[in-house]
């Protein structure tokens, strides 16, 4: 978790002098509770926005927006703490809006926004806005939270972001798999425009089960420049196991930008349809 660019972050608006500060996520009002505290944020909204860094890279960012309730506690509002928690790592990053002037009611509802938390593809975050000072131990909570799931690199808008492109999102291998005679699979896919090797991972399963009955790895050497964007055809030999008929083919590239952590693409071949007709019963039963 990080902030985009660390350029001057602004929270001031007409009628309010405000500064954005780094926060330890442990506001002083936790330790020294105040008697009078503001009410909670209203109508917390989160959107995925896309922002360029000063270097020109494009990153997904969480755009956080909320409004104030129109009650008298606005007079005791000293700022807000914005917290983003990445759920699978428990990593948390906070910033603090510090109000340098008193808020006054005006003709329209106060609205605040912040769009500088960089988020990762396919990650879920808990986004919390806490009004400051925080409430006394038994006081009503004055925060609002939402869990926000960022789309993965398959998403059309995410595909062109720097983190997705770095992991190979622009490569579309257009995998085709066909079953040949004599227990063979023919795998065909489009090579990317980089002289790097690929790996085909074959995993076979019984018809209705999820534990594998056959696994095979096939290495494809780095193509020459004249082979870029061409189709690569590979024939894989299967183990002759009755019922081991559902095949998952996964292609792992090793692009220089992502090495052994690139996006993988896969295709699945289902088992052939079983005939509905029952086995014929023999006319006689052998006695031995």
């Amino acid at each position: 978790l990080r902030l985009l660019d660390h350029r001057a972050l602004v929270c001031s608006q007409p009628g309010l002098n405000c500064t954005v500060k780094n926060s330890t996520c442990l506001d002083d009002s936790w330790i020294h509770p105040r008697n009078l505290t503001p009410s909670s944020p209203k109508d917390l909204q989160i959107q995925l926005h896309f922002a360029h860094t000063q270097q020109g890279d494009l990153f997904p960012v969480a755009h956080i927006e909320w409004t104030l309730q129109t009650d008298a506690s606005i007079l005791y509002l000293e700022g807000a703490e914005l917290s983003v928690l990445q759920l699978n790592t428990n990593e948390r990053l906070c910033v603090r809006f510090e109000f340098l002037s008193k808020l006054r009611h005006h003709h329209r509802r106060w609205r605040f926004t912040f769009s500088h938390f960089v988020v990762d593809p396919d990650q879920e975050y808990e986004v919390t806005v806490h009004h400051l000072p925080k409430p006394i131990p038994d006081g009503d909570p004055n925060h609002q939270s939402k869990n926000f799931l960022v789309p993965d690199c398959e998403h059309a808008r995410m595909k062109v972001t720097t983190p997705c492109m770095s992991s190979g999102s622009l490569w579309d291998p257009n995998i085709t798999v066909e079953t040949l005679e004599a227990h063979q699979l023919r795998v065909s896919f489009t090579l990317w425009n980089e002289s790097t090797h690929y790996q085909i991972l074959l995993t076979s399963f019984p018809h209705m089960e999820n534990h594998s009955c056959f696994e095979h790895m096939h290495h494809i050497p780095a193509p020459r420049p004249e082979e870029f964007h061409q189709r690569s055809n590979v024939t894989l030999t299967l183990r002759n196991l009755k019922g081991c008929c559902r095949h998952q083919v996964q292609i792992q590239p090793f692009f220089s930008s992502c090495l052994n952590d690139c996006l993988r693409h896969s295709a699945t071949v289902s088992c052939p349809e079983m005939p509905d007709t029952p086995e014929p019963i023999p006319d006689y039963m052998p006695l031995w």
Partner: nanobody, 126 residues
Framework: EVQLVESGGGLVQPGRSLRLSCVAS????????MHWVRQAPGKGLEWVSG????????DYADSVKGRFTISRDNAKNSLYLQMNSLRAEDTALYYC???????????????????RGQGTLVTVSS
């Protein structure tokens, strides 16, 4: 112009099933989370269910959990709601709604619904 057109509502007996459909046009359907919301007679709008852009995540209001199933077909720009074991309290006008935000928030919209359809009426009565 964004359009959401719901269908599939009707009069049904308690315990029976219905399947609602919604066809979307005028925006990149596959980029957005979609939701079903409903409005019972004389009541406010109630969120029913949501589904992420790629169907990877689905959420339901407690009142419909285990009975309703949301799904989508991005190739057909369509959203569905399979409603089983219907009860009288499910009687409402059902709307298909588009999330304003890209991304997905569990338990409702991330950022309001910027569009919803005209609705399809579901009446559960014996």
């Amino acid at each position: 112009e964004v359009q959401l057109v719901e269908s599939g509502g009707g009069l049904v007996q308690p315990g029976r099933s219905l399947r609602l459909s919604c066809v979307a046009s005028g925006f990149a359907f596959a980029d957005y989370a979609m939701h079903w919301v409903r409005q019972a007679p004389g009541k406010g709008l109630e969120w029913v269910s949501g589904i992420s852009w790629n169907s990877g995540r689905r959420d339901y209001a407690d009142s419909v959990k285990g009975r309703f199933t949301i799904s989508r077909d991005n190739a057909k720009n369509s959203l569905y709601l399979q409603m089983n074991s219907l009860r009288a309290e499910d009687t409402a006008l059902y709307y298909c709604a588009k999330d304003r935000a890209i991304g997905y928030c569990s338990g409702g919209s991330c950022s309001d619904f910027d569009y919803r359809g005209q609705g399809t009426l579901v009446t559960v009565s014996s």
